[in-house]
C-alpha cells in the first residue's frame, strides 16, 4: 500500500494473507469459514492462509493450508478480465472478534464513493518495502468514463478504479487480491495498475466484485 | 544511475559450461522490484531470451534452453549469473544483461520491458 | 509459442522521410508489445513499452500504436542517428519472452 498508515487494529477481520511457505503472495478475503476470495493472477499449486491477526508472522493467527483454487472460468491472462478467484481452505476457520466473514455487496457503489484498500504489500515503489502489519488507505471510485481517459482499451467493464487526483494513495505489489471496501461491503479486489506503485492520477484497478456474486456463490454451493 | 556490467570467460570449449556474470551498480539488485534478464545475439542474428530471475529469486526459462540454463543471484554482491551448460559452437553470441522493468504492478507485473542493458560480452565456442 | 513477424526486414529512406515498420503477434498480445533500437556493436534500447508509451529520454519523433496482434512503430523525421536495426518484443504471461526478426533501416 503506497501513502497509506498502519489499520485500526482487529478493523479488517476478514482480511487474510495468501502465502507461499512464508513468504508474503498475495492478499485476500474471507467469504466463509471455508472459502477465500481472491484474484486469479494469485494462483498457485497450494496455498497457506494467514487469519486473524494484522501482524504476518504472528503466532497467534491461524495458520490454514489450502490446495484447492477455482479461477473464474473467464479469466484472461492477457486481458485480465474477469480477475478472481475462490481458494477452499483445508480445514475450516474459526470465527471471532478478529476472524469475520466479509460482506458481499448487494449492489455497485456509485464513483466517488470514499473506500478502504488494505494489504501487506510492498509500501515503496520500486524499492520494496513490505511490511509487517496490515496497512490502508482511503482512495475514491473513479468513473468507467475518467478511468479510460487513463487506460484506454486496457479497462474491461467488470474492472473498478479508484484513487485520489494528485494523490500517491494505491496499492501496489503483495497487495493483488485483497479488498476495497466501501460503506462495510467488498466493491473490489486488488487486480493491477501501473509501475512503479503510486504515479499520481494513475488509478488502481480493481475487479468489481458487485458483477460476480452471483459466481461467487455458486462455485461455492458446486464445490461444498 | 543503475548500471550493469557482463563478465566471464570468452572462449568455451564445446560440452563445457559457459559461467557469466552480471554486476549491478547504483542499485540494490535484492530490494529493486524488477526483473534481472539474459538474451543473446548470435553473430549476424536477432535476440534471443535466455532467462530472467526476479528480486525474490524466482526463475523463468526459455523452453528451448531449460535443460541447460540456470540463472542465479549473489545478493551479497549485487550480481546475477547465467550458467548454460552442455554447450556448442550454436552458443556462440554476444550474451547481454538487461533489467527488466514491470509493465504494471498486480497483474501486469508479470509483464516487461528491457530498459537497461549491460554492453554485451562475446562468448565463443570452439576447441 | 507466440511468433513475432517484423516487416519489412530491411529498408531505405532519406533523412527527413516518415518511417513505419510493423510487427505482427500470431496470437494477441494485448498492449505487451516493446521497441527497441540496435546500432552496431552496440546493446539494444528501450524506445517504446506498452505498444504506444514513449520510454524517458526517447525522442518524441518516435511512436508506437497497435493493440492485439498488429503493432506499428512510426519514426515522423527519420534523422541521421536513426539508422539503425529495430526490433519488437512481446512480454508474455507464460514464457517464452520473443522478440521479432528486426528491421534494419538504411541510408538510401
Known amino acids: 500500500i503506497i501513502d497509506g498508515a498502519p489499520c485500526a487494529r482487529g478493523s479488517h477481520p476478514w482480511q487474510v494473507a495468501l502465502l507461499s511457505g512464508n513468504q508474503l503472495h498475495c492478499g485476500g478475503v474471507l467469504v466463509n469459514e471455508r472459502w477465500v476470495l481472491t484474484a486469479a493472477h494469485c494462483k498457485m499449486n497450494e496455498y497457506t492462509v494467514h487469519l486473524g491477526s494484522d501482524t504476518l508472522g504472528d503466532r497467534r493467527a491461524q495458520r490454514i493450508k489450502a490446495s484447492k483454487s477455482f479461477r473464474h472460468p473467464g479469466y484472461s491472462t492477457q486481458t485480465h478480465v474477469n480477475d478472481l478467484m475462490l481458494v477452499k481452505l483445508n480445514s475450516q476457520a474459526r470465527l471471532s472478534s478478529m476472524v469475520k466473514k466479509v460482506r458481499l455487496p448487494s449492489r455497485c457503489e456509485p464513483p466517488g464513493t470514499t473506500c478502504t484498500v488494505s494489504g501487506w504489500g510492498t509500501t515503496t515503489s520500486p524499492d520494496v518495502t513490505f511490511p509487517s502489519d496490515l496497512m490502508c488507505v482511503d482512495v475514491k471510485l473513479i468513473s468507467p468514463q475518467d478511468c479510460t481517459k487513463v487506460y484506454k482499451d486496457l479497462l474491461e467493464n467488470s474492472m473498478l478504479c479508484a484513487g485520489i487526483p494528485d494523490s500517491k494513495k494505491n496499492a501496489c505489489n503483495g497487495d493483488s487480491g485483497g479488498p476495497l471496501v466501501c460503506r462495510g461491503t467488498l466493491q473490489g479486489l486488488v487486480s493491477w495498475g501501473t509501475f512503479p506503485c503510486g504515479q499520481p492520477n494513475d488509478p488502481g484497478v480493481y475487479t468489481q466484485v458487485c458483477k460476480f456474486t452471483k459466481w461467487i456463490n455458486d462455485t461455492m454451493k458446486k464445490h461444498r | 544511475q543503475l548500471q550493469l556490467q557482463e563478465s566471464g570467460p570468452g572462449l568455451v570449449k564445446p560440452s563445457e559450461t559457459l559461467s557469466l556474470t552480471c554486476t549491478v551498480s547504483?542499485?540494490?539488485?535484492?530490494?529493486?522490484?524488477?526483473?534481472w534478464v539474459w538474451i543473446r545475439q548470435p553473430p549476424g542474428k536477432g535476440l534471443e531470451w535466455i532467462g530472467s530471475?526476479?528480486?525474490?529469486?524466482?526463475?523463468y526459462y526459455n523452453p528451448s534452453l531449460k535443460s541447460r540454463v540456470t540463472i542465479s543471484v549473489d545478493t551479497s554482491k549485487n550480481q546475477f549469473s547465467l550458467k548454460l551448460s552442455s554447450v556448442t559452437a550454436a552458443d556462440t553470441a554476444v550474451y547481454y544483461c538487461a533489467r527488466g522493468r514491470p509493465l504494471g504492478y498486480g497483474a501486469r507485473h508479470y509483464y516487461y520491458a528491457m530498459d537497461v542493458w549491460g554492453q554485451g560480452t562475446t562468448v565463443t565456442v570452439s576447441s | 509459442d507466440i511468433q513475432m513477424t517484423q516487416s519489412p526486414s530491411s529498408l531505405s529512406a532519406s533523412v527527413g522521410d516518415r518511417v513505419t515498420i510493423t510487427c505482427r503477434a500470431s496470437q494477441s498480445i494485448s498492449s505487451y508489445l516493446n521497441w527497441y533500437q540496435q546500432k552496431p556493436g552496440k546493446a539494444p534500447k528501450l524506445l517504446i513499452y506498452s505498444a504506444s508509451s514513449l520510454q524517458s529520454g526517447v525522442p518524441s519523433r518516435f511512436s508506437g500504436s497497435g493493440s492485439g496482434t498488429d503493432f506499428t512503430l512510426t519514426i515522423s523525421s527519420l534523422q541521421p542517428e536513426d539508422f539503425a536495426t529495430y526490433y519488437c518484443?512481446?512480454?508474455?504471461?507464460?514464457?517464452?519472452?520473443?522478440f521479432g526478426g528486426g528491421t534494419k533501416v538504411e541510408i538510401k
Open positions: 547504483g542499485g540494490s539488485i535484492s530490494s529493486l522490484d524488477y526483473y
Open positions: 530471475i526476479d528480486y525474490s529469486g524466482d526463475t
Open positions: 518484443q512481446q512480454s508474455p504471461y507464460f514464457p517464452p519472452l520473443t
